[in-house]
């Protein structure tokens, strides 16, 4: 038994036929010693007398609000809730399994940007006697603050004969660092109480993995002379992180009729305009995705082909515009070849995802995982890799990136990747290894050697352990190179002389 909140207690029960249940001792919160009686819920039947009451809790009939009285006066209440464990598994009766992205997904969370603000939602078919409370933190062993609001009913849907209720909650990390590479996941815990049943649900994620941008805004069409094509332009959504030269998006532009089975024109671009073939009764749609990290695509923003939008065929806000930043040399050190670094780091992002695309859909946060990921270097908040830090002095950040590149290059050349099951030198991992080396050499200033971090002694003995470790390292590398790519894209747009 444990206290959920003041005067509310959860009794954990192994739930099977003829289970002995749990013995619970309730104590009346009063200085009185004599003449105390106990009742359950609205019943006037006296269950016992004395300052304490011992009960055997086996089923829901034994749960409820226990009240101690003296004379006609109520002294205190204790509400007992039951948390069922069947075959070693805690019950999940209150919430509906959303089955996306995998089975046993009860909580789903999304973030519109990297500000540390996110929304979680869940589904239930229960309409009454239902309460939720939400807690969140970053990391679990030394948790950092995340503040969540109250869960509210956000939607009602009819599914066949049943009504389905969607609840949602908004949370905000107290000290968010949008430009940093997350090393500890956000933990979300939802307590659900239906009548006398208690259940808890948890979710663990990095903000980068739940990013889903809002759709692009302000779609405009401009017909092109002597062509069947139109130029479509758009702008970054207002809710996306800024500056866009650092937090860049990539876009998919599609022309399609009302039916998904109809023919279409489709093109991908990093710019905020594209030329496509429009036709009568079709629509042009544009959606966005983080350019350097393969999280979710936004919903589509659409405009009909007929009546070509407004006449302003402007090119939008420019995906890599650097705001009003003047070009300037990097103080405190030689300037890197920003554009070359940008191209190579973007290639690294592509390679990191093609090295094992499934890595993005595997849940690798298991026991012992924090040891693995804490062994690798992360680009942290104080490393100067945010836009302001880069403008002040990019050397700190570049040194950190260089250390990370060398570290991962050594890791990809180690027994973890060279041992069984073997990988060929020109596999995506082989190409990744070579590109890490290439970028680190571009960064290393002449006659200047930055200190490098020691490679950890991770030597798995079994091939399956090696495989799991590879996945974890690649997953971590995907996050690292995404931050590096943002740094170089921003540098190329705003710092390059």
């Amino acid at each position: 038994i444990w206290e959920l909140k003041k005067d509310v207690y959860v009794v954990e029960l192994d739930w099977y036929p003829d289970a002995p249940g749990e013995m619970v001792v309730l104590t009346c919160d009063t200085p009185e010693e004599d003449g105390i009686t106990w009742t359950l819920d609205q019943s006037s039947e006296v269950l016992g007398s004395g300052k304490t009451l011992t009960i055997q809790v086996k089923e829901f009939g034994d749960a409820g609000q226990y009240t101690c009285h003296k004379g006609g006066e109520v002294l205190s209440h204790s509400l007992l809730l039951l948390h069922k464990k069947e075959d070693g598994i805690w019950s999940t009766d209150i919430l509906k399994d959303q089955k996306e992205p995998k089975n046993k997904t009860f909580l789903r969370c999304e973030a519109k940007n990297y500000s540390g603000r996110f929304t979680c939602w869940w589904l239930t078919t229960i309409s009454t006697d239902l309460t939720f409370s939400v807690k969140s933190s970053r990391g679990s062993s030394d948790p950092q603050g995340v503040t969540c609001g109250a869960a509210t009913l956000s939607a009602e849907r009819v599914r066949g004969d049943n009504k389905e209720y969607e609840y949602s909650v908004e949370c905000q990390e107290d000290s968010a660092c949008p430009a940093a590479e997350e090393s500890l996941p956000i933990e979300v815990m939802v307590d659900a109480v239906h009548k006398l049943k208690y259940e808890n649900y948890t979710s663990s994620f990095f903000i980068r993995d739940i990013i889903k941008p809002d759709p692009p805004k302000n779609l405009q069409l401009k017909p092109l002379k002597n062509s069947r094509q139109v130029e479509v332009s758009w702008e970054y959504p207002d809710t996306w992180s800024t500056p866009h030269s650092y937090f860049s998006l990539t876009f998919c532009v599609q022309v399609q009729g009302k039916s998904k089975r109809e023919k279409k024109d489709r093109v991908f671009t990093d710019k905020t305009s594209a030329t496509v073939a429009c036709r009568k009764n079709a629509s042009i749609s544009v959606r966005a995705q983080d350019r350097y990290y393969s999280s979710s695509w936004s919903e589509w923003a659409s405009v009909p082909c007929s009546g070509s939008g407004s006449s302003r065929g402007g090119s939008g806000s420019g995906g890599s515009g650097g705001g009003g930043s003047k070009l300037r040399a990097v103080p405190g050190g030689s300037s890197p070849a920003w554009t070359q670094c940008q191209q190579l780091s973007q290639k690294l992002c592509t390679l990191a995802w093609s090295a094992h695309p499934l890595v993005g859909h595997m849940d690798l946060r298991e026991e012992g995982d924090e040891e693995t990921t804490n062994d690798v270097p992360h680009i942290q908040c104080g490393d100067g890799c945010d836009p302001q830090g880069l403008r002040d002095n990019s050397q700190f950040c570049l040194q950190r990136i260089h250390q990370g590149l060398i570290f991962y290059e050594k890791l990809l050349g180690s027994d973890i990747f060279t041992g069984e099951p073997s990988l060929l030198p020109d596999s995506p991992v082989g190409q990744l290894h070579a590109s890490l080396l290439g970028l680190s050499q571009l960064l290393q200033p002449e006659g200047h050697h930055w200190e490098t971090q020691q490679i950890p002694s991770l030597s798995p003995s079994q091939p399956w352990q090696r495989l799991l470790l590879r996945f974890k390292i690649l997953r971590s590398l995907q996050a690292f190179v995404a931050v590096a790519a943002r740094v170089f894209a921003h540098g190329a747009a705003t710092l390059s002389p």
Partner: antibody, heavy 118, light 107 residues
Framework: QVQLVQSGAEVKKPGASVKVSCKAS????????LHWVRQAPGQGLEWMGW????????EYAPKFQGRVTMTTDTSTSTAYMELRSLRSDDTAVYYC???????????WGQGTMVTVSS | EIVMTQSPATLSVSPGERATLSCRAS??????LHWYQQKPGQAPRLLIY???QSISGIPARFSGSGSGTEFTLTISSLQSEDFAVYYC?????????FGGGTKVEIK
């Protein structure tokens, strides 16, 4: 299944025109874009243009603009590509191809060899 | 127009070995890149679309990667039926253009 059958080989004199046909079957003709791509002997592939059989919209590669005409006959599910003012370097295999996506080529015809020789 | 350059022009590989073919665009084309296989006397066949998307019916040994200006087609273990000419094609902008091709021949 989706199939494209092209007309037979042609031999033409320089300055003449050629009209190659491409008969589609196994799908609703107006549901796919149709492209023409050519390949000179021992050479690579060269895109010529596309037509939307639903409305007759066309887009030609600048190299062929003014010299090529692509048309369709929806009643017979046939596409045509006419190339005028033939030169010897127009000697090639001409392929028609169809796809629901405009910008790449899924289903190909067997090709029609056009020889331009005096 | 966008110029596509493939390398090497000819690649000699033994059956069972891995083949890596490269394609470079003269400007950034995001992932608007497709790969085809052509055998002598036959029409080309689509292998990969949008840089890395696989086609049903195409063996899993064919995979594509890349974005921007550099792309790779990998054949993990060459079978006898894979000896052919491979072309890349960009769809970023019209006119659509192809690379010059890479001939994969038996070593």
């Amino acid at each position: 299944q989706v199939q494209l059958v092209q007309s037979g080989a042609e031999v033409k004199k320089p300055g003449a025109s050629v009209k190659v046909s491409c008969k589609a079957s196994g799908y609703t003709f107006t549901d796919y874009y149709l492209h023409w791509v050519r390949q000179a002997p021992g050479q690579g592939l060269e895109w010529m243009g596309w037509i939307d059989p639903e409305n007759g919209d066309t887009e030609y590669a600048p190299k062929f603009q003014g010299r090529v005409t692509m048309t369709t006959d929806t009643s017979t599910s046939t596409a045509y590509m006419e190339l005028r003012s033939l030169r010897s370097d127009d000697t090639a295999v001409y392929y028609c191809n169809a796809n629901k996506e405009l910008r790449y080529f899924d289903v190909w015809g067997q090709g029609t060899m056009v020889t331009v020789s005096s | 127009e966008i110029v596509m350059t493939q390398s090497p022009a000819t690649l000699s590989v033994s059956p069972g070995e891995r083949a890596t073919l490269s394609c470079r665009a003269s400007q950034s084309i995001s992932i608007n890149l497709h790969w085809y296989q052509q055998k002598p006397g036959q029409a080309p066949r689509l292998l990969i679309y949008f840089a890395s998307q696989s086609i049903s019916g195409i063996p899993a040994r064919f995979s594509g990667s890349g974005s921007g200006t550099e792309f790779t087609l990998t054949i993990s273990s060459l079978q006898s039926e894979d000896f052919a000419v491979y072309y890349c094609q960009q769809s970023n902008s019209f006119p659509l253009t192809f690379g010059g091709g890479t001939k994969v021949e038996i070593k």
